[in-house]
Interface confidence: low
């Protein structure tokens, strides 16, 4: 599923991401834009053999199990395929664990490079939330 910007903002808000660990909703929408272009089925393989899955590009080295990443920790205790669902519950729940891990949203390279320090509220402007 490819979400619309405001559609995703509303879904993320429903799932409790607005101001989760101090990160406003705009940060999450911005991260999703530059990680996956709002596509729940986005996957990207990394040169270390791991793969990033879903709308927030969650990595199989640490957070989920895809059965083919040596040394995977599966800290979210989920199959990576769950992160590709049009239902973003699994991605949100795992993202909450990631952002609580100490580095905050810096765990997402796209957020660090494209969203951090920018006017992230622009990503929810005009949305009926």
């Amino acid at each position: 599923k490819v979400f619309g910007r405001c559609e995703l903002a509303a879904a993320m808000k429903r799932h409790g991401l607005d101001n989760y660990r101090g990160y406003s909703l705009g940060n999450w929408v911005c991260a999703a834009k530059f990680e996956s272009n709002f596509n729940t089925q986005a996957t990207n393989r990394n040169t270390d053999g791991s793969t990033d899955y879903g709308i927030l590009q969650i990595n199989s080295r640490w957070w989920c199990n895809d059965g083919r990443t040596p040394g995977s920790r599966n800290l979210c205790n989920i199959p990576c395929s769950a992160l590709l669902s049009s239902d973003i519950t699994a991605s949100v729940n795992c993202a909450k664990k990631i952002v609580s891990d100490g580095n905050g949203m810096n765990a997402w390279v796209a957020w660090r490079n494209r969203c951090k320090g920018t006017d992230v509220q622009a990503w929810i402007r005009g949305c009926r939330l």
Partner: antibody, heavy 116, light 107 residues
């Protein structure tokens, strides 16, 4: 050991549809992407798309959207590619491969001939 | 789409020669470049993954190098079994794309 066994050669008429199968053995089928690749003489190798059997997630090369449809049956460890509205341009060898970004394991190929 | 251009299209060599095959990408693909060998009426076989990592069971005479947009497959002292087609492939972005191939033939 990992093996991908594709279905046999097909001769089809223009306008018809065909379904090619790829049976996987020797690994956990549901967690690896199955890729589909087309090869025509003089046209090299073309990536058609991929399916993740465990979730049914698919990605298609824009060029093949509407032409190819991927499905997978995890109970039989078999992936399928259906090609519709066949024309002579679809005559080719079609390969399935196990995807890891790179393709370390390939099926033997299915030769499709479209002829009236 | 990322275009991969292979050169030369055909390379005529004598067994024992050492050769280099080139693959150039239309934009940077980091190290997400892989090489395959294909003999007539056979499936492609992975030789090198991620520019320089040898695939399992591949002879040490095959090696890869490069980064960004320019990549090379080298064969040190070609053997008769090495003749065939060689393709590069990128996995940096979708759609995955292949080069047009280099035919390695006996002189």
């Amino acid at each position: 050991q990992v093996q991908l066994q594709e279905s046999g050669a097909e001769v089809m008429k223009p306008g018809a549809s065909v379904k090619i199968s790829c049976k996987a053995t020797g690994y956990t089928f549901s967690t690896y992407w199955i890729e589909w690749v087309k090869q025509r003489p003089g046209h090299g190798l073309e990536w058609i798309g991929e399916i993740l059997p465990g979730s049914g997630s698919t990605y298609y090369n824009e060029k093949f959207k509407g032409k190819a449809t991927f499905t997978a049956d995890t109970s039989s460890n078999t992936a399928y590619m259906q090609l519709s509205s066949l024309t002579s341009e679809d005559s080719a060898v079609y390969y399935c491969a196990r995807g890891d970004g790179h393709y370390g394991y390939w099926g033997q190929g299915t030769t499709l001939t479209v002829s009236s | 789409d990322i275009e991969l251009t292979q050169s030369p299209a055909t390379l005529s060599v004598t067994p024992g020669d050492s050769v280099s095959l080139s693959c150039r990408a239309s934009q940077s693909i980091s190290n997400n470049l892989h090489w395959y060998q294909q003999k007539s009426h056979e499936s492609p076989r992975l030789l090198i993954k991620y520019v320089s990592q040898s695939s399992s069971g591949i002879p040490s005479r095959f090696s890869g190098s490069g980064s960004g947009t320019d990549f090379t497959l080298s064969i040190n002292s070609v053997e008769t079994e090495d003749f065939g087609m060689y393709f590069c492939q990128q996995s940096n972005s979708w759609p995955r794309t292949f080069g047009g191939g280099t035919k390695l033939e006996i002189k």
